[in-house]
């Protein structure tokens, strides 16, 4: 059997196989050692007994999408049946005091591979034997502690495979420079040691995406905005836009990145090299936000131009191509020497990313201030608590609720939170009355809210002792 017979139904075309060469990967035309690595079809009854105590689940994730030319990393994590885990030696053990359907196990081991390898590897001290090999016959790499790695992972995509020895979790990175744009399928088959052979325990597949568009995401934050995820913001308060470029392999680390903003409110284009920008909308309504990100990234060098006409003189070698914009044709140099590549020459290509959002601008509470605090005189001579009136003003829309969070003087340990609907006139002046149990210094956070906004103000308040001889006073 060949690898492609074992690993997947997806058969890429000859063109795909030729143009998607992955560095360090091998062709799935290679032979598969079925004696050491048996192959079971889906639904084969042997899967049921491939692992003691249940089935192992493999979870495959990637940091897709990947900008073409960058690295994409795949991670496989094995999830064992309940109460099982991998120990420091790579053996699979039962967790202490954990009950599964079979109850508590007397034997601490599910698989004691350390014992197996000591029994089975009596081969002249080289640590190499005919069974310490991958499915294509290549020997296992002898990293320190390799004997504690008891799982064999075979990754398969684009007509190629990659073999890796590992523990219950492995990562593989692939450079996407030669990968065709669009969605691709990665399949992983996992085997475990079984004496002098291997047993399949899990198969998993996942789609990853390679793109020539910079993956861009924008977070938007605005003070007093009640819900930052609903793309509704407040008039007359700045919104902070923060551009996040999905570049987990840091492919664009050394690129100059330009951000071109159109806020959709007839304020024109704004170009910046900073990933954050502030913008204030001064009108209510719906606006179309557009961002274009441009980065000069390492990319393929352009094809050489047509051969020169013999009549022309030869220019010097000094001119070498350094930069190439995907939106412009290649240079029209006509000397064959001019484009003979200097080894490892870095060509650059402009990559673009786009983000578009429709945002709604509405009225909101812009500001809230406590303008006065008054100790309310109680009708009883020795009250246990103090009533404090906070006179509050606000700007913007009419609030519908008020919340007070009373905490310790550091404003960290909340003592109580009280929220209630509030009736405010168009002047936005209201009095909030709150109870304080006992004298001392308190931190008061007061928020006014409506459907779209939440405005906060804070103050420290000193509640005096209730000595009948001492006058009532307020200290702020």
């Amino acid at each position: 059997k060949r690898f492609h017979d074992v690993l997947g139904n997806e058969r890429p075309s000859a063109y795909m196989r030729e143009h998607n060469q992955l560095n360090g990967w091998s062709s799935d035309e290679n032979d598969w050692n079925e004696k050491l690595y048996p192959v079971w079809k889906r639904g084969d009854m042997r899967w049921k007994n491939s692992w003691k105590g249940g089935r192992v689940q493999a979870v495959l994730t990637s940091d897709s999408p990947a900008l073409v030319g960058s690295n994409i990393t795949f991670a496989v994590n094995l999830i064992f049946p309940r109460c099982q885990k991998e120990d420091a030696n790579g053996n699979i053990v039962y967790e202490k005091n954990c009950r599964n359907e079979a109850g508590l196990s007397a034997d601490p081991y599910v698989y004691n591979w350390t014992a197996w390898s000591e029994d089975s590897d009596g081969e002249n001290g080289t640590g190499q034997s005919h069974h310490n090999v991958f499915p294509d016959g290549k020997p296992f790499p002898h990293h320190p502690g390799w004997r504690r790695w008891n799982f064999i992972y075979v990754f398969h995509t684009l007509g190629q495979y990659f073999q890796k020895l590992g523990r219950c979790s492995v990562r593989v990175s692939v450079n996407t420079a030669n990968v065709t744009l669009g969605p691709q399928l990665m399949e992983v088959t996992v085997y475990r040691r079984h004496g002098r052979a291997y047993v399949p325990i899990a198969q998993v597949k996942d789609v990853y995406v390679v793109t020539d568009q910079i993956p861009v995401f924008v977070t938007m934050f605005q003070k007093n905005d009640r819900n930052s995820s609903d793309e509704t913001f407040l008039k007359d308060l700045p919104i902070m836009f923060d551009v996040l470029i999905h570049d987990p392999s840091h492919f664009l680390n050394y690129s100059t990145i330009n951000y071109k903003w159109s806020f959709g409110d007839n304020t024109g284009l704004f170009v910046s090299t900073n990933h954050t920008v502030n913008h204030t909308y001064v009108l209510n309504g719906t606006f179309s936000l557009n961002l274009t990100v441009k980065a000069a990234a390492p990319g393929p060098c352009p094809p050489p131009p047509p051969p020169p006409r013999p009549s022309k003189p030869t220019p010097s070698l000094a001119t070498t191509l350094k930069s190439y914009d995907s939106n412009t044709p290649g240079p029209a140099g006509d000397n064959p020497l001019e484009l003979s590549r200097i080894p490892d020459e870095n060509c650059q290509i402009n990559r673009y990313g786009h983000f578009q959002a429709t945002i709604t601008i509405v009225e909101g509470i812009l500001e809230v201030n406590i303008i006065q605090m008054t100790d309310v005189l109680m009708p009883v001579p020795w009250p246990e608590s103090s009533l404090i009136d906070f006179v509050v003003t606000c700007q913007g829309s009419i609030p519908t609720e008020v919340c007070t969070i009373i905490s310790d003087p550091t404003c960290e340990i909340t003592q109580n939170t009280v929220c209630s609907p509030v009736d405010v006139d168009e002047m936005c002046l209201l009095t909030v009355r709150r109870t304080f149990n006992g004298s001392g210094t308190y931190c008061v956070n007061l928020t006014l809210g409506d459907d779209t906004s939440l405005a906060l103000t804070s103050t420290l308040i000193s509640v005096p002792d209730r000595d009948p001889a001492s006058p009532l006073r307020m200290a702020n």
Epitope: T400, V418, C419, D423, T431, R433, D450, D451, T452
Partner: antibody, heavy 116, light 110 residues
Amino acid sequence: EVQLLESGGGLVQPGGSLRLSCAASGFTFAARPMSWVRQAPGKGLEWVSSISHSGGSKYYADSVKGRFTISRDNSKNTLYLQMNSLRAEDTAVYYCARKWSTFDYWGQGTLVTVSS
Amino acid sequence: QSVLTQPPSASGTPGQRVTISCSGSSSNIGNNYVSWYQQLPGTAPKLLIYADSQRPSGVPDRFSGSKSGTSASLAISGLRSEDEADYYCGAWDSSLNAYVFGGGTKLTVL
């Protein structure tokens, strides 16, 4: 002068529906929260529901949650209470009241009788 | 069973001063304004006191409200026959997220 006028009450069978209206005048309706309060025959006052000036915030008593819906049309200066899955214990005079942290003006009420 | 507790009845003779109590908790009376409502027989309720002790215009100064901790009181001085009515206290309850009323006190002028 502030005026609140309820309508839409009447006799309805258990499980039935009714929609109450409250026409408001004499103040800026769109700037005020509004509420519904009911009073069963011979019993005390029970708050039913409240709505903010814009209609974005709504509160309901546990006894009516999921069955009653409060709404408003600021262009018509009208408050509504849609009552579904009515029960015998919903029988009461329903008052429309201005504001929600205190009820400073009340309508005269409309009687809702739920009976088979 | 009402969240706010009022005595079911109170009485007094004309000219006398009567007090109606209303007891609650920190989530209602303790941290929110108390209102008092008067309901004359066969009519809609009317706001008598708001913000613990404030009187709306048109309400005689014979009516006064006060609050201490988690209790509130309505005092009526110079009692008159026309004060015979049901009186309800009310406050927002921040734990229930609901407006709560007392069970009502029937005031009889003897």
